[in-house]
């Protein structure tokens, strides 16, 4: 089942999936002046089984120059409803998602694909909120989000996350200011990460997992 | 159920303090951070400030700033608004709200300064 | 700071009518905003989030649509119990704002 909407958005916060549920569809998306090969799949989905899940179909584009049009590929009016982007920086994946049963990792990119990816998440989904560059976490409260079907209609839970550009907050006595991040630099001038204790994502992966989680950013 | 329970009605001098309280229960107290708003008398709703239940940190309005003291006591899942040298234009009902979209509000507390 | 300004500031409808109230904010605040109905002697209640996610428990006769600067809450036909004021609140930045309410009064 589809989720009917784009995850909440949160500001001063974007958010990533760590890993995708079976079911999910990538559009096969090409950058300007390139477009799909004819023929070519409209979409990467994750299947799998019980053991293992990978991405279907493989998105393949080709330059647009032998052709009359240069018109970038877009999705169909029917596929538009689950318009989920996200701007490609880096391929690198910190974290092996494949652990997770029923998941796919992040797909590896493909030669010439646009500079954002379009999901079409399914009820399920997790995604995870960080603080933008230049802001901190007033609140850190679960700051994920899932898509939930509740009396048939699909939901995304509100992450319970603030990012303040203030930097200088007020505390009450004898409470300790939460820890630095990892890297050891005061929360004020870092992003904040989501591998705090407050998140029970799963004991490997919240070991293992950096800032570069967040490479990959949502719009 | 979620439920905000704040203290009872308050009589002050101006000049005076005045700490009220807000207990949060049927949830995790620590996931949400408090809003403090109050309302004066026919007026509309103005926000004093956010605090997280979780760190302590807290963020006011400018007007407020130095005047109100937001603090929570997590053992008793309890948040409290210190308001100092209180003035009429002080009289109103005071909300503590959850969240980030004040999903659930607390049933006011109103506070009256007059001499 | 981010002023939020409410039209018309009071109302008067007829059981069943289509009302309109809007929102606008003096910056772009994308959806960050929240709808509040509030009865006299109560705390406000919300009805909307995130500028157009139904509160629980919200009757879906309401619904709020809008982005950026400009918001609306539309009530499809009003009820007698729908009668208060409403207030618009953005949660973009500190200090976060209420506009100044509209009153909804049943003909």
């Known amino acids: 089942e589809l989720c009917d909407d784009d995850p909440p958005e949160i500001p001063h916060a974007t958010f990533k999936a760590m890993a995708y549920k079976e079911g999910t569809m990538l559009n096969c998306e090409c950058k300007r002046g390139f477009r799909r090969i004819k023929s070519g799949s409209l979409y990467m989905l994750c299947t799998g089984n019980s053991s293992h899940s990978s991405w279907d179909n493989q998105c393949q584009c080709t330059s647009s120059a032998t052709r009359n049009t240069t018109k970038q590929v877009t999705p169909q009016p029917e596929e538009q409803k689950e318009r989920k982007t996200t701007e490609m920086q880096s391929p690198m994946q910190p974290v092996d998602q494949a652990s997770l049963p029923g998941h796919c990792r992040e797909p590896p990119p493909w030669e010439n694909e646009a500079t954002e990816r379009i999901y079409h998440f399914v009820v399920g989904q997790m995604v995870y909120y960080q603080c933008v560059q230049g802001y901190r976490a007033l609140h850190r409260g679960p700051a994920e989000s899932v898509c939930k079907m509740t009396h048939g209609k699909t939901r995304w839970t509100q992450p319970q996350l603030i990012c303040t550009g203030e930097m200088e907050t007020s505390q009450f006595p004898g409470e300790e200011k939460p820890q630095a991040s990892p890297e050891g630099r005061p929360e004020s001038e870092t992003s904040c990460l989501v591998t705090t204790t407050d998140f029970q994502i799963q004991t490997e992966m919240a070991a293992t997992m950096e800032t570069s989680i967040f490479t990959t950013e949502y719009q | 159920q979620v439920q905000l329970v704040q203290s009872g009605a308050e009589v002050k001098k101006p000049g005076a303090s005045l700490k009220i309280s807000c207990k949060g229960s049927?949830?995790?107290?620590?996931?949400?951070?408090m809003h403090w708003v109050r309302q004066a008398p026919g007026q509309g709703l103005e926000w004093i400030g956010v605090?997280?239940?979780?760190?302590?940190?807290?963020i006011y309005a400018q007007k407020f700033q130095g005047r109100a003291t937001m603090t929570v006591d997590k053992s008793t899942s309890t948040a409290y608004l210190e308001l100092s040298s209180l003035r009429s234009e002080d009289t109103a009902v005071y909300y503590c709200?959850?969240?980030?979209?004040?999903?659930?509000w607390g049933q006011g507390t109103t506070v009256t300064v007059s001499s | 700071d981010i002023q939020m300004t409410q039209s018309p500031s009071s109302l008067s409808a007829s059981v069943g009518d289509r009302v309109t109230i809007t929102c606008r904010a003096s910056?772009?605040?994308?959806?960050?905003l929240e709808w509040y109905q509030q009865k006299p002697g109560k705390a406000p209640k919300l009805l909307v989030y995130n500028a157009k996610t139904l509160a629980e428990g919200v009757p879906s006769r309401f619904s709020g649509s809008g982005s950026g600067t400009d918001f609306t809450l539309t009530i499809s036909s009003l009820q007698p119990e729908d009668f208060g004021t409403y207030y618009c609140?953005?949660?973009?930045?500190?200090?976060?704002?209420f506009g100044q309410g509209t009153k909804l009064e049943i003909k």
């Open positions: 910056q772009d605040i994308s959806n960050y």
């Open positions: 605090i997280s239940t979780y760190s302590g940190d807290a």
């Open positions: 049927g949830y995790t107290f620590t996931d949400y951070a």
């Open positions: 609140q953005h949660h973009y930045d500190t200090p976060y704002t």
């Open positions: 709200a959850r969240g980030v979209t004040f999903d659930y």
